[in-house]
């Protein structure tokens, strides 16, 4: 009915699904048949497929709707051409003519948009022992209007990081520690400079690679170890070591030895596996008291770290397999017998 629908001006944030134009064509063939039904197709000016046309089959009215977000920055003005046609082919010799085509000009107006990060999550990987001031990562955002960006960090609870607010480069400002938690997650805020202060948020995940910086230690509390006195035969007990460093693909490989030479007459340590060792008495002549046995544990790492731990072992009189103490001497009663 109409070949030029003129100019249509819309803001680039117009909702998807909005009907922006109603078009009407007529067909002289028998109503409600394939010969008179009209379908509308956009044939030019919308290569991005931002628009679509729905047809009411009863009235042959076409409704131009927004299928994808409009974008002022990529297409401020579009000359849209659409075609009205039947779903059934025309009879031989009849062609669609100029009256089967119509057009309108879509003018998209700019709406100030927030900056857009190039990624939802930025990841970086560094060794936990990097020097303070080392660049550990980089984030980038762009403003659709071409304005500059000011970057800031949010949620840097450990105070480890600083972002260059102009370039988005992230630097360490304190010693990092994998054992405190890796990856370390913070939020990055990109704010548009130049008035509106619209902002967007992304994540920065800092994966910390392990450095052997934790000496071995006992895996649990070994207070309360005891042997019944007097020993009838040499005895032994098993203990476990651990450390807080990362042990990929294989467990720790600790080596164990006595912490001082003076202990060697009374005790010996033998390795069971990478984490467990056995402490044995060399004889039975021990006094009825507590002995503190120092054990040296080496992790064999790079660099190798060593921990000296103490195992307190009590020799005491036993009643039914438990350490006996007269009333009034209850403090620190051992609870684990050998």
């Amino acid at each position: 009915e109409k070949s030029d629908y003129g100019n249509l001006t819309l803001a680039e944030d117009t909702n998807i699904g909005s009907t922006i134009l109603t078009i009407q064509a007529t067909d002289a063939d028998e109503p409600f048949t394939g010969s008179s039904k009209i379908l509308y197709h956009i044939i030019k000016g919308d290569s991005e497929g931002r628009l679509g046309v729905d047809t009411d089959p009863h009235t042959n009215t076409g409704y131009v709707i927004i299928k994808k977000p409009l974008d002022f920055e990529t297409a401020a003005v579009s000359n849209i051409v659409f075609k009205a046609e039947n779903p059934e082919p025309l009879v031989f010799g009849v062609k669609y003519n100029a009256s089967s085509f119509a057009k309108f000009t879509l003018i998209v107006t700019d709406v100030n948009e927030a900056p857009q990060f190039s990624q939802h999550v930025f990841q970086a990987k560094v060794s936990e022992d990097v020097a303070i001031g080392t660049k550990v990562g980089n984030v980038t955002a762009k403003d659709p209007e071409g304005l500059d960006i000011s970057y800031s960090l949010r949620g840097d609870t450990r105070g480890w990081l600083k972002i260059d607010h102009v370039t988005g480069e992230i630097f360490s400002v304190a010693p990092l520690d994998r054992e405190a938690g890796s990856p370390y997650r913070v939020q990055v805020v990109a704010t548009e400079v130049g008035g509106s202060s619209l902002s967007s948020v992304s994540e920065f995940h800092l994966i910390l690679m392990d450095v052997n910086d934790n000496p071995p230690r006992l895996a649990k509390d070994y207070t309360g170890l005891f042997f019944c006195h007097p020993l009838s035969a040499p005895g032994s007990l098993i203990f476990e070591a651990t450390d807080d460093d990362q042990h990929l693909f294989r467990g720790p490989h600790f080596t164990f030895s006595l912490g001082s030479g003076s202990l060697q007459n009374d005790w010996e340590v033998s390795k069971i596996n990478g984490t467990h060792a056995r402490l044995s008495t060399r004889h039975t002549e021990f006094e009825e008291r507590e002995y503190v046995v120092l054990i040296r544990i080496n992790d064999g790492g790079r660099p190798p770290l060593e921990g000296i731990v103490s195992l307190p072992v009590t020799f005491c009189s036993c009643v039914e397999g438990s350490c006996f103490r007269p009333a009034g001497h209850q403090t620190g009663i051992p609870t684990v017998g050998m």
């Epitope: 762009k142 071409g146 500059d148 000011s150 260059d164 102009v166 370039t167 704010t191 400079v193």
Partner: antibody, heavy 120, light 108 residues
Framework: QVQLQQSGAELVKPGASVRMSCKSS????????IHWVRQTPGQGLEWIGA????????SYNQKFRGKVTLTADKSSSTAYMQLNSLTSEDSAVYYC?????????????WGQGTTVTVSS | DIVLTQSPAIMSASLGERVTMTCTAS???????LHWYQQKPGSSPKLWIY???NLASGVPARFSGSGSGTSYSLTISSMAAEDAATYYC?????????FGSGTKLEIK
């Protein structure tokens, strides 16, 4: 028109501090980064740091961290730079400069400079 | 830090002569973040060319800039008396932003 007016020359003793100002006019102060650059005959132009008066975000050259503090007062459209523990090496002309709001990060307007002389 | 090396340090040119000075970066710089400033004695630097090849407001058309990666240049097609000054290149791809040590252009 855009102008950055810096405070006057300073003669200070070693170990002392100095605070200089950079008053902006002719544009929206809170919408542009203000940078500080120093110039010495020996070192040429050296970037010290920058502040975004809109929210106070700042960045420093690692070389000047701990030596310099940058602040901005929105009400007077003035940026400030405080230099601490001055030595003879800090004798220089200090410039403030506005960074363009476009993504080029160029410094499109500069103050006239503040000359700092450190001498006992 | 990205180091910018300018050459020559000092050059002289006759009026009307074509002049080219270069700026070499220690690592690649995006052309968007490479700028040139002009400074005359007793004055502050002035933005002269931004993003490698765009002339700042008021800069005569005889000036041009080009380059990419680590190699950039400023050219004057025909030297004029008022072009005598020191020219600094500047990168702001990475923090800290850095400046070249300058090329001092004199009239022969």
């Amino acid at each position: 028109q855009v102008q950055l007016q810096q405070s006057g020359a300073e003669l200070v003793k070693p170990g002392a501090s100095v605070r200089m100002s950079c008053k902006s006019s002719g544009y929206t102060f809170t919408s542009y980064n203000i940078h500080w650059v120093r110039q010495t005959p020996g070192q040429g132009l050296e970037w010290i740091g920058a502040i975004y008066p809109g929210n106070g975000d700042n960045s420093y050259n690692q070389k000047f961290r701990g030596k310099v503090t940058l602040t901005a007062d929105k009400s007077s459209s003035t940026a400030y730079m405080q230099l601490n523990s001055l030595t003879s090496e800090d004798s220089a002309v200090y410039y403030c400069a506005r960074q363009t709001a476009r993504t080029t990060r160029a410094m499109d307007y500069w103050g006239q400079g503040t000359t700092v002389t450190v001498s006992s | 830090d990205i180091v910018l090396t300018q050459s020559p340090a000092i050059m002289s040119a006759s009026l009307g002569e074509r002049v080219t000075m270069t700026c070499t970066a220690s690592s690649s710089v995006s052309s968007s973040y490479l700028h040139w400033y002009q400074q005359k004695p007793g004055s502050s630097p002035k933005l002269w060319i931004y993003s490698t090849s765009n002339l700042a407001s008021g800069v005569p058309a005889r000036f041009s800039g080009s380059g990419s990666g680590t190699s950039y240049s400023l050219t004057i097609s025909s030297m004029a008396a008022e072009d005598a000054a020191t020219y600094y290149c500047h990168q702001y791809l990475r923090s800290p932003p850095t400046f070249g040590s300058g090329t001092k252009l004199e009239i022969k």
